[in-house]
Amino acid sequence: TQHGIRLPLRSGLGGAPLGLRLPRETDEEPEEPGRRGSFVEMVDNLRGKSGQGYYVEMTVGSPPQTLNILVDTGSSNFAVGAAPHPFLHRYYQRQLSSTYRDLRKGVYVPYTQGKWEGELGTDLVSIPHGPNVTVRANIAAITESDKFFINGSNWEGILGLAYAEIARPDDSLEPFFDSLVKQTHVPNLFSLQLCGAGFPLNQSEVLASVGGSMIIGGIDHSLYTGSLWYTPIRREWYYEVIIVRVEINGQDLKMDCKEYNYDKSIVDSGTTNLRLPKKVFEAAVKSIKAASSTEKFPDGFWLGEQLVCWQAGTTPWNIFPVISLYLMGEVTNQSFRITILPQQYLRPVEDVATSQDDCYKFAISQSSTGTVMGAVIMEGFYVVFDRARKRIGFAVSACHVHDEFRTAAVEGPFVTLDMEDCGYNIPQTDESTLMTGRA
């Protein structure tokens, strides 16, 4: 884990109050029974914020033990705190569960910084504000960790929603969502609406506020506006996609598109930032600096370290450019673009200067493991993880932060040739070396 970046996360609704849903435009996708419509019981079932993660309430064991679990599309283990820890208010007590089964196997997950380790078992799991089902799922009971749990984050475990290929200790450990789909009639699809506040929230405000929605088994019309546009899942490990073009305020970065996906591009709710490969990051920052050149900011700001503050309510959003990522479309030679605002990539930070200030960190950072479309991207959009059809959908989120002049957008189609060439083929290596630096 890189502090401030990757799980556990250490990192904009200004337009409408929570709960106010904007009217939907027409949806050209055909209705699919059981997949679309209203999922009232699941709407607003997430809490949290981009800097510390979004979590859902889950119950584990018999009788049920309630825990808050971080939703992470960038990993594939269901892992929960199972021993006392200074940052945990509660933890999974296996000895109190009559349905717990020990798998007599350990699991160790190191990150770039920090780690967790534990013991594998299975137990009955349900999601109170989710589908009305109970499944027997693999659980990693975390007995030791370092720089994993976050003080004040209010979550006690992690729900890895990616594919078995990246599960630990190996791909034979079935991920939770696979178990859910196998054991129930829940369609093989989930969707996420992460709602950034656009302003810093203190602990009590996070507990009281809505953080968004995880719709399990379907798509909720009320959570987005306009149309959903889909990009293929390139390979079922992470949720890997292909970026074919990048623009800053409409200006093409003009890089070989392979650079955008070197060595992969993934959609990851468990990462705070938009993370870009070194060359792409440098080009993007140069372009963002040029676009906002009427004001200069300290070098440390562009590194995501120093905070920049403005008097409350005077943040000059207009000087910062919009960023567009073009994604491979479902049709040959067709792409679409998703556009985020500075309200997404400048992350509000609490408890620093004075109450008369609004302070932000730059939430785009450098990566050595490819592009990571983290919470700052996802907070602009309703994102559909359509596993059944091996695709990811994007639509403008009904809760994204914007101003009166600009809004996040999902637009298409655009003609883009030779998009397959944009994908990078990772040389086959021992998976253990591939996985230890989950930046």
Partner: antibody
Framework: QLQLQESGPGLVKPSETLSLTCTVS??????????WGWIRQPPGKGLEWIGN???????YYNPSLKSRVTISVDTSKNQFSLKLSSVTAADTAVYYC????????????WGRGTLVTVSS | EIVLTQSPATLSLSPGERATLSCRAS??????LAWFQQKPGQAPRLLIY???NRATGIPARFSGSGSGTDFTLTISSLEPEDFAVYYC??????????FGGGTKVEIK
């Protein structure tokens, strides 16, 4: 080498406006590498940041002084200025102009300072 | 608001002795901290930036250390010209606005 020199009246009456100018010599105020700032120090006390300006005219002010402060720049004269309105005795201080370098983060070069007394 | 607390308020030492000055931030400022020296009737002078980097022309007897919330300025062997007031300043929050209250190093 680059030098900064503050100038302006040493005595200002209460409720009036304090006006100071900082002249940059030995270098250009239009350098894209620096912000320029004002800091003050009441007699026998610590340092208080007032505000910064970039040659483009972009300004940042101390929230506690913002309603009374204006900082401006005149690139043709290689100068930047401070105006502090509605002064009281509490504004009596040595006023320093300084350059904000090292990635716009640190006050790495200071003027000698000028004492401004607010008194009737 | 980030508050910088310097200690001790006054340090009485003799030339040749080692001086250790402390600056504590009310919350983490990473390594974005500076140290200034101010002699009577003069403007402050930048000694250390980014917690541990000596500014141009600053003698090697001055060194800075620390990160997060606890920082130290060390003068390995006091010279007569080192007796002055020393201030720390955080620039983690930008624009840089917060100075510590100062430590006076006086001749014993």
């Amino acid at each position: 080498q680059l030098q900064l020199q503050e100038s302006g009246p040493g005595l200002v009456k209460p409720s009036e406006t304090l006006s100071l100018t900082c002249t940059v010599s030995g270098g250009s105020i239009s350098s894209s590498s620096y912000y320029w700032g004002w800091i003050r120090q009441p007699p026998g006390k610590g340092l208080e940041w007032i505000g910064n300006i970039y040659y483009s005219g972009s300004t940042y002010y101390n929230p506690s002084l913002k309603s009374r402060v204006t900082i401006s720049v005149d690139t043709s004269k290689n100068q930047f200025s401070l105006k502090l309105s509605s002064v009281t005795a509490a504004d009596t201080a040595v006023y320093y102009c300084a350059r904000l370098g090292h990635g716009y983060s640190y006050f790495d070069l200071w003027g000698r300072g000028t004492l401004v007394t607010v008194s009737s | 608001e980030i508050v910088l607390t310097q200690s001790p308020a006054t340090l009485s030492l003799s030339p040749g002795e080692r001086a250790t000055l402390s600056c504590r931030a009310s919350q983490s400022v990473s390594s974005y901290l500076a140290w200034f020296q101010q002699k009577p009737g003069q403007a402050p002078r930048l000694l250390i930036y980014d917690a541990s980097n000596r500014a141009t022309g600053i003698p090697a007897r001055f060194s800075g250390s620390g990160s997060g919330t606890d920082f130290t300025l060390t003068i390995s062997s006091l010279e007569p010209e080192d007796f002055a007031v020393y201030y720390c300043q955080q620039v983690y929050v930008w624009p840089p606005r917060t100075f510590g209250g100062g430590t006076k190093v006086e001749i014993k």
